[in-house]
Interface confidence: medium
Amino acid sequence: AITEAREEAKPYPLFPGPFPGSLQTDHTPLLSLPHASGYQPALMFSPTQPGRPHTGNVAIPQVTSVESKPLPPLAFKHTVGHIILSEHKGVKFNCSISVPNIYQDTTISWWKDGKELLGAHHAITQFYPDDEVTAIIASFSITSVQRSDNGSYICKMKINNEEIVSDPIYIEVQGLPHFTKQPESMNVTRNTAFNLTCQAVGPPEPVNIFWVQNSSRVNEQPEKSPSVLTVPGLTEMAVFSCEAHNDKGLTVSKGVQINIKAIPSPPTEVSIRNSTAHSILISWVPGFDGYSPFRNCSIQVKEADPLSNGSVMIFNTSALPHLYQIKQLQALANYSIGVSCMNEIGWSAVSPWILASTTEGAPSVAPLNVTVFLNESSDNVDIRWMKPPTKQQDGELVGYRISHVWQSAGISKELLEEVGQNGSRARISVQVHNATCTVRIAAVTRGGVGPFSDPVKIFIPAHGWVDYAPSSTPAPGNADPVLII
């Protein structure tokens, strides 16, 4: 923070009287420095009334004064009011003012269109001091003007919180038309009307627009900017541009392609990413979208078996992510797969068909009609069954797994037997007498072990008991059969 001490000093009116003398034209500036803009008001000497001295609030230092002279009215000198120049040319303009030396804390700044020009390197302030006044010339230069330099420039000087403002200097940068809106590429439906817009500005104005289609002018008479071209419809792709003309010359917009929407090209590179017994994961590379975004895709699957009825399964999916898992397929089967995608116009042709196979799976059903009986003479248990239906084997049978559990007086023991695929019977030795034997059978393929059949129980009596009867898989819903002999 700073404090200003007021004191009795040179008494004189604030802005009265004529200009005391004139500025010599052969003066050279004692100082030239880049203009520090962005001034803020600060404490400065401000007479309370013309002709009245100040009374300070601290000890007053002795001042031997130069003889007082009347001060001139403070105003910027008139200068050029309007500068018209071409783009990329250089320009320099200035404002000048003579300020009594008492105002050693004034501020001078450049403003453009109401905004202060801060840190402007192209502003230079030159000072020409004399005994009583200092002539100030604030220059502003732009080496290569651009359209953005157009505007109204003023100088401001702040003295005692009063602002002195120069007359505005209007800078008008003229050049070729400058596009503010150019036509944009579009994808349109065949024979459907659409609009294109083109807008360009000067100065100089006016700016006139001509439309060009495939290198030929569309309109004989120019339209004043902005211009909207209505195209009634196209049957094939076309390139449009617009020409903007003013007194300085012509500017041509970028050429934009107008495409006609069509059905997509078929997908390419359909490939198998992964196969299981009942599903296939496929991917594809989408074809050209026909200038209209893909909506969805269709996966067509047919059995490759020549004996199949040739029916086609269809799976619909979204266009992204070019990946689909086809489910509910048969194991160890061959399929032909094709993909088609659609946009707003219609469906593409189907991609080239590819062959794919599901892998071998574990059987999906257990062996049927399991029966168990005791062969007491040989002390064996005979087991018979029917193999699962071929379609539900989900692969080539390699055998069966037999689980037999022996339970007697709180003791339980499970044994597993593997038997070959030939035949549909097996014989197991009696492990424990006076016990219950529970038998379950599962079919086995290279794909794994299928589900076990429902348990069939048979009671194995102590030696010397009478005859017996077989036990078999119960009808669904019945309790587990137990045969006690």
Partner: antibody
């Protein structure tokens, strides 16, 4: 050429006063504000404030209010710095420095005096 | 008040070296920074003002750059007569000096 010549070194006792002078030549004295800057031993530079050489109005920064007075004798183009009730911490080199711009809120110093050493010791 | 942080506080370099000193302000100072050279027992000498404007008569090996809060003073090829203390001054809001950089020859 433009120059500022300051008075010689001073050795003072605590409580005394000292007056340092700064004589300008080679330019219009009343056109450029004059600042004072303190450089204590082993310390950086500290701006003390400035005086309007035309009106004689001084402006002091917070650290230099009360015992410090800026004054002028424009007839001999001289600025003065007076320090009263001297303390040991006033021991420093004091520079006068001309403001580089005649009219500007923001200024730097383009010409400096050679400095005056003030030593306060009992 | 605006603080100016100058670094390094001292620096040793060889003749012909490129020397760089930085000043960082506590807020944007609108490029209002000047750089001074002070030799022992002498008055400071203005080298650069307004960030990069070289004072008339100052050799072109001295330069300044920066904006916002970060400013750099450079001596492109150090000469024996450049041995001095250098300091920055911000003059955007009141006046604040940097602490100074003492430059010595290796």
């Amino acid at each position: 050429q433009v120059q500022l010549v300051q008075s010689g070194s001073e050795l003072k006792k605590p409580g005394a006063s000292v007056k340092v002078s700064c004589k300008a030549s080679g330019y219009t004295f009343t056109a450029y504000g004059m600042s004072w800057v303190k450089q204590a031993p082993g310390q950086g530079l500290q701006w003390m404030g400035w005086i309007n050489t035309y009106s004689g109005v001084p402006t002091y920064t917070d650290d230099f209010k009360g015992r410090f007075v800026f004054s002028l004798d424009t007839s001999v183009s001289t600025a003065f710095l007076q320090i009263s009730s001297l303390k040991a911490e006033d021991t420093a080199v004091y520079f006068c420095a001309r403001r580089a711009a005649v009219v500007a809120k923001y200024w730097y110093f383009d010409v400096w005096g050679q400095g005056t050493t003030v030593t306060v010791s009992s | 008040d605006i603080q100016m942080t100058q670094s390094p506080s001292s620096l040793s370099a060889s003749v012909g070296d490129r020397v760089t000193i930085t000043c960082k302000s506590s807020q944007d100072i609108n490029k209002r920074i000047s750089w001074y050279q002070q030799k022992p027992g002498k008055a400071p000498k203005l080298l650069i003002h307004s960030t990069s404007s070289l004072q008339p008569g100052v050799p072109s090996r001295f330069s300044g750059s920066g904006s916002g809060r970060d400013f750099t003073f450079t001596i492109s090829s150090l000469q024996p007569e450049d041995i001095a203390t250098y300091f920055c001054l911000q003059y955007d809001n009141l006046l604040t000096f940097g602490q100074g950089t003492k430059l010595e020859i290796k």
